[in-house]
Amino acid sequence: IIDGYKCKEGSHPWQVALLKGNQLHCGGVLVDKYWVLTAAHCKMGQYQVQLGSDKIGDQSAQKIKATKSFRHPGYSTKTHVNDIMLVRLDEPVKMSSKVEAVQLPEHCEPPGTSCTVSGWGTTTSPDVTFPSDLMCSDVKLISSRECKKVYKDLLGKTMLCAGIPDSKTNTCNGDSGGPLVCNDTLQGLVSWGTYPCGQPNDPGVYTQVCKYKRWVMETMKTHR
């Protein structure tokens, strides 16, 4: 997260880190005791999932292996539409005040809605500085019409943009797959943005979760 702030401890109990060994690979969101939602471009053969801590690499955090993941069948490595994936944990999470599932959206929030994005991605760009603490940024949803002015044909129908006019605050590498939460519901998953990160008026681009609720529910049901 560029130009963000340290998240209030315990305020994001659904936030998970997908680790490759001990290294951060992507963010993710707990949606059920067995399931984590993340970006399809974060796919690996297997994952170490850290839950229940704002500190990356926290020894006291829950760590659960995951060996199965299900990319959206419409994910395209060319256009990166449908950049969404479910990761099935090998064992169920122990729910607590520090570990909770996020609320999936009932509707799509409109442009102008205030949201918070979080992650352990680099806080500087192009040179990298990976924080140990979970970082947050407050952003507002931007209409597709406005966002298309910047990203033109790169912006797919189920991509969502968020940012603050003239501000550098944004996501960056390492934040991918992490949550954009608006009015206590998951509205976006970090997907992409311009590099170097933090260029004012280049919004962050997210997968619009409200358009995938049926797929999420059906996939979890099918692979129970």
Epitope: H25, K78, D127, T194, Y195
Partner: antibody, heavy 127, light 107 residues
Framework: QVQLVQSGAEVKKPGSSVKVSCKAS????????ISWVRQAPGQGLEWMGA????????NYAQKFQGRVTITADESTSTAYMELSSLRSEDTAVYYC????????????????????WGQGTMVTVSS | DIQMTQSPSSVSASVGDRVTITCRAS??????LAWYQQKPGKAPKLLIY???SLQSGVPSRFSGSGSGTDFTLTISSLQPEDFATYYC?????????FGGGTKVEIK
């Protein structure tokens, strides 16, 4: 001024492996993409694969999938390309090239222009 | 994967001539195309990126145009140092793919 300096020429036997290095002198490539391109004698350019070290993205052309491994050591600003199960058709000049990504995340491979190239490494495969 | 078809494969021209090289992608690649120049025994050199942006230090006689599937490299007035082989490459997404090359020879 950043330069990419590649390791020296190699002569290899069929079936063996070769590992070519590419070091960035006068700069770093941690936030760049490093691509590997080869050119057989009298032939055109062939893209083999690329890595973006800070994004952890490595991607390979289908033709080389399973035979090529591209890695990067950020501490020494050195990229490596290892090609295994060598055959005579792998005789070529191998180039590394550096370019800055335009995007992070899902779109990180899009539109990279490789503006700095190594001098090339001749790999000869012969029994 | 996206295929790139470059034409002509060779062209004979004189100093001062206008030379046009075309590149066609098998599917739309927006403006994500670059052009490189290569001289014998040397590494390729970037001329044009994002279909029409001139790389710093490259003479303005080189220009690029096109979008989608059809792209053109134009040398407005061929100079002696321009005799070389030119390649297009699609940079829409990995895996990148080069065209077959166009050799610009002295007539």
């Amino acid at each position: 001024q950043v330069q990419l300096v590649q390791s020296g020429a190699e002569v290899k036997k069929p079936g063996s492996s070769v590992k070519v290095s590419c070091k960035a002198s006068g700069g770093t490539f941690n936030n760049y993409a490093i691509s590997w391109v080869r050119q057989a004698p009298g032939q055109g350019l062939e893209w083999m694969g690329a890595i973006i070290p800070i994004f952890g993205v490595a991607n390979y052309a289908q033709k080389f999938q399973g035979r090529v491994t591209i890695t990067a050591d950020e501490s020494t600003s050195t990229a490596y390309m290892e090609l295994s199960s060598l055959r005579s058709e792998d005789t070529a000049v191998y180039y590394c090239a550096r370019g800055a990504p335009n995007y992070y995340g899902a779109q990180s491979s899009r539109g990279i222009a490789f503006d700095i190239w190594g001098q090339g490494t001749m790999v000869t495969v012969s029994s | 994967d996206i295929q790139m078809t470059q034409s002509p494969s060779s062209v004979s021209a004189s100093v001062g001539d206008r030379v046009t090289i075309t590149c066609r992608a098998s599917q739309g690649i927006s403006s994500w195309l670059a052009w490189y120049q290569q001289k014998p025994g040397k590494a390729p050199k970037l001329l044009i990126y994002a279909a029409s942006s001139l790389q710093s230090g490259v003479p303005s006689r080189f220009s690029g145009s096109g979008s989608g599937t059809d792209f053109t490299l134009t040398i407005s007035s061929l100079q002696p140092e321009d005799f070389a082989t030119y390649y297009c490459v699609q940079a829409n997404a990995f895996p990148y793919k080069f065209g077959g090359g166009t050799k610009v020879e002295i007539k």
